[in-house]
Interface confidence: medium
């Protein structure tokens, strides 16, 4: 779109409230260490400037691109060099290189203090004293910790956050009302951030084609009654939206997402019968609802896929004429028939089909060569089915905590070089697949489990990319987006790993563990488990179980003692000695 003033165009489209919120998110995602007050000041300056451009689009600097305007504003921050080091060098560059430079410095694991939740009364007072500042602070704190959070969706979270405080701060029991809502928002927010991080990684590391293939598969499962043409149009628009958000173009992204929701709702009849309720909601809720809408029912009379993609004599002609369109049609037709498959499995099948056509369409008898292509799909389908079956059985047998521990041991043995906090975080999340997906019937297990695992393994990949320590992780993360999970599954114990030196300090615990929440206590124990495996990678399950049981008993005993700190000091020494003996350290 060629507008005289891009900033005026977006201000008018989005309205002042959303404009300010999105600029704050954009700035906080770029300058993650800046104090809240500094960001608010910058946002207010940009907003005032935008208003002058709305009044007169020909006013000075109103014709500048948003990247130029925002970049110039960010580069006025006085402490840029001291706070961000080499990121300050970005300011010496011209657009578009300057924006690319800022993007490259986004930190997935910023060195920021953990967000501690104040007392409910304190929060309610802050909310009532200055609602606007309170909500801005929420946007700022989430955005700086999650630099790829999907900005229009963060506006939706903020709306729910505000609604929770509006309702609960008037309730008789404020805490009982508010805390479960905040927990739910926190958990959903982390999940939303991780899902968006995978989309951005897909676009940035594997390109637009990879993202479009993912989108064709997912939208075809969700909208099986829609024409291929309609799905293609939605994919094109969705790709634009996510490319913009992942590229820091948050105003354009939010605007285009609203346009896409409008289009989908105007054309429900040719997209899905499940959209009616979503389309009656206000904009932010509508967009969220559409993104989460359940799969429509599959058309009853779908013909066999083999006719068009195997038996037809025109397969190579059609493939040659428009390769990506033909593969897109294959993916669409396969995905709409298989809501029971994960998106990554569907993409593996499409890749196998593409590889076969590339080989066979150059052969003497192409038809004979590709006639059995569907037979090659069988092992690809069975592998995730078997893996999910085995792991769900293990989960049902162990429960979530012990299942997480099994995965911690498994993954520490595969990639022991990875930092302990990363192994704990990733394995805990991998373990959540059990409670998230194993409850589902067979037909829903694979799309739930394998697509969730893709999201979690991407967390490992982006964290590892910041400080690479394992060639095996790098290989699995970079070779193929859709084969990441099979690649990690196939890793055996790393025989080249030199066990970590034993350090008693790692296994020294104090009375503060007793006041931790159950979740935080689990993390402490799981951190110890990872360290144990790093010291003794060849330890058996039985040995590790014995040590962990002793450890749990030790914590329980000392937390009940009168003099907790003395108990931890004395009993801790005994535990360390016993553990060393048990593991032969």
């Amino acid at each position: 779109d060629a507008h005289k003033s891009e900033v005026a165009h977006r201000f008018k489209d989005l309205g002042e409230e959303n404009f300010k919120a999105l600029v704050l998110i954009a700035f906080a995602q770029y300058l993650q260490q800046c104090p809240f007050e500094d960001h608010v000041k910058l946002v207010n300056e940009v907003t005032e400037f935008a208003k002058t451009c709305v009044a007169d689009e020909s006013a000075e600097n109103c014709d500048k691109s948003l990247h130029t305007l925002f970049g110039d504003k960010l580069c006025t921050v006085a402490t840029l060099r001291e706070t961000y080091g080499e990121m300050a060098d970005c300011c010496a560059k011209q657009e578009p290189e300057r924006n690319e430079c800022f993007l490259q410095h986004k930190d997935d694991n910023p060195n920021l203090p953990r967000l501690v939740r104040p007392e409910v009364d304190v929060m309610c007072t802050a909310f009532h004293d200055n609602e606007e500042t309170f909500l801005k602070k929420y946007l700022y704190e989430i955005a700086r910790r999650h630099p790829y959070f999907y900005a229009p969706e963060l506006l939706f979270f903020a709306k729910r956050y505000k609604a929770a405080f509006t309702e609960c701060c008037q309730a008789a029991d404020k805490a009982a009302c508010l805390l479960p809502k905040l927990d739910e928002l926190r958990d959903e927010g982390k999940a939303s951030s991780a899902k968006q991080r995978l989309k951005c990684a897909s676009l940035q590391k594997f390109g637009e084609r990879a993202f479009k293939a993912w989108a064709v598969a997912r939208l075809s499962q969700r909208f099986p009654k829609a024409e291929f043409a309609e799905v293609s149009k939605l994919v094109t628009d969705l790709t634009k939206v996510h490319t913009e958000c992942c590229h820091g173009d948050l105003l354009e992204c939010a605007d285009d997402r609203a346009d896409l929701a409008k289009y989908i709702c105007e054309n429900q009849d040719s997209i899905s019968s499940k959209l009616k309720e979503c389309c009656e909601k206000p904009l932010l809720e509508k967009s969220h609802c559409i993104a989460e809408v359940e799969n429509d029912e599959m058309p009853a009379d779908l013909p066999s896929l083999a006719a068009d993609f195997v038996e037809s004599k025109d397969v190579c002609k059609n493939y040659a004429e428009a390769k990506d369109v033909f593969l897109g049609m294959f993916l669409y037709e396969y995905a709409r028939r298989h809501p029971d498959y994960s998106v990554v499995l569907l993409l593996r099948l499409a890749k196998t089909y593409e590889t076969t056509l590339e080989k066979c369409c150059a052969a003497a008898d192409p038809h004979e060569c590709y006639a059995k292509v569907f037979d090659e799909f069988k092992p690809l389908v069975e592998e995730p089915q078997n893996l999910i079956k085995q792991n769900c059985e293990l989960f049902e047998q162990l429960g979530e905590y012990k299942f997480q521990n099994a995965l911690l041991v498994r993954y520490t043995k595969k990639v022991p070089q990875v930092s302990t906090p990363t192994l704990v975080e990733v394995s805990r999340n991998l373990g959540k697949v059990g409670s998230k997906c194993c409850k589902h019937p067979e037909a829903k297990r694979m799309p739930c489990a394998e697509d969730y695992l893709s999201v979690v393994l991407n967390q490992l990949c982006v964290l590892h990319e910041k400080t690479p320590v394992s060639d095996r992780v790098t290989k699995c993360c970079t070779e193929s987006l859709v084969n990441r999970r099979p690649c990690f599954s196939a890793l055996e114990v790393d025989e080249t790993y030199v066990p970590k030196e034993f350090n008693a300090e790692t296994f020294t615990f104090h009375a503060d563990i007793c006041t931790l929440s159950e979740k935080e206590r689990q993390i402490k124990k799981q951190t110890a488990l990872v360290e144990l495996v790093k010291h003794k990678p060849k330890a058996t399950k039985e040995q590790l179980k014995a040590v962990m049981d002793d450890f749990a008993a030790f914590v329980e005993k000392c937390c009940k003692a009168d003099d907790k700190e003395t108990c931890f000091a004395e009993e801790g020494k005994k535990l360390v000695a016993a553990s060393q003996a048990a593991l032969g350290l």
Epitope: D1, A2, E227, F228, A229, E230, S232, K233, T236, D237, D259, K262, Y263, E266, N267, D269, S270, N318, E321, A322, V325, M329
Partner: antibody, heavy 120, light 109 residues
């Protein structure tokens, strides 16, 4: 190369019917949206109707809704326009045009048109 | 009655630049990036010049360019040549239908 050849036009009395055909060649017909666009003598272009790739969804200008029916036969690579209850204002040169893989976007290829005259 | 508004005629000398406007509403031109432009030479079928607001169709010279601001789209022809004399139509997607402009006749003086 892409070819679209319209046929079936002619002189018809008001209230009468005609069926236009458009034979397509040089591309995979079933991949593309197809359109009918008309042009009255000395006037501009007017969009008449559109049909999706499989023929499941059809769209019409208000001026022809309820009287005209667009359809396609992908096996025969042919687009049709059944025109009933014709009026003098339907007199025009009728073009068949190929759209894109999706509904929106330009009409990249056009036939030479077939003349329809409605007169008593 | 055309839904999109174009000037009936424009003119320019060889080598010069002309711009043809196409005014619509937020439901058509202003909605999404779905404006296209066509050239119709006398006695010929229309030919696609531009699609998706500003993308040139295959084989179209870069003398033809287009853009959009708000609810108005524009086609610019630079380095005018005598063979550019023709009728030019804009079109836009609108809620499941397509709408055309009334057309603009370009005269090369």
């Amino acid at each position: 190369q892409v070819q679209l050849v319209e046929s079936g036009g002619g002189l018809v009395q008001p209230g009468g019917s005609l069926r236009l055909s458009c034979a397509a060649s040089g591309f995979t017909f079933s991949y593309y949206w197809m359109y009918w666009v008309r042009q009255a003598p000395g006037k501009g272009l007017e969009w008449v109707s559109a049909i999706d790739t499989r023929g499941g969804s059809t769209y019409y200008a208000d001026s022809v809704k309820g009287r005209f029916t667009i359809s396609r036969d992908n096996a025969k690579n042919t687009l049709y326009l059944q025109m009933n209850s014709l009026k003098p204002e339907d007199t025009a040169l009728y073009y068949c045009a190929r759209g894109g893989l999706v509904r929106v976007g330009g009409l990249g290829s056009w036939g030479q048109g077939t003349q329809v005259t409605v007169s008593s | 009655q055309a839904v999109l508004t174009q000037p009936p005629s424009v003119s320019g000398s060889p080598g010069k630049t002309v711009t043809i406007s196409c005014a619509g509403t937020s439901s058509d031109v202003g909605y999404g990036n779905y404006v296209s432009w066509y050239q119709q030479l006398p006695g010929m079928a229309p030919k696609l010049l531009i699609y998706d607001v500003s993308k040139r169709a295959s084989g179209i010279t870069d003398r033809f360019s287009a853009s959009k601001s708000g609810n108005t789209a524009s086609l610019t022809i630079s380095g005018l040549q005598s063979e550019d004399e023709a009728d030019y139509y804009c079109a836009s997607y609108r809620s499941g239908t397509t709408v055309f402009g009334g057309g603009t006749h370009l005269t090369v003086l």
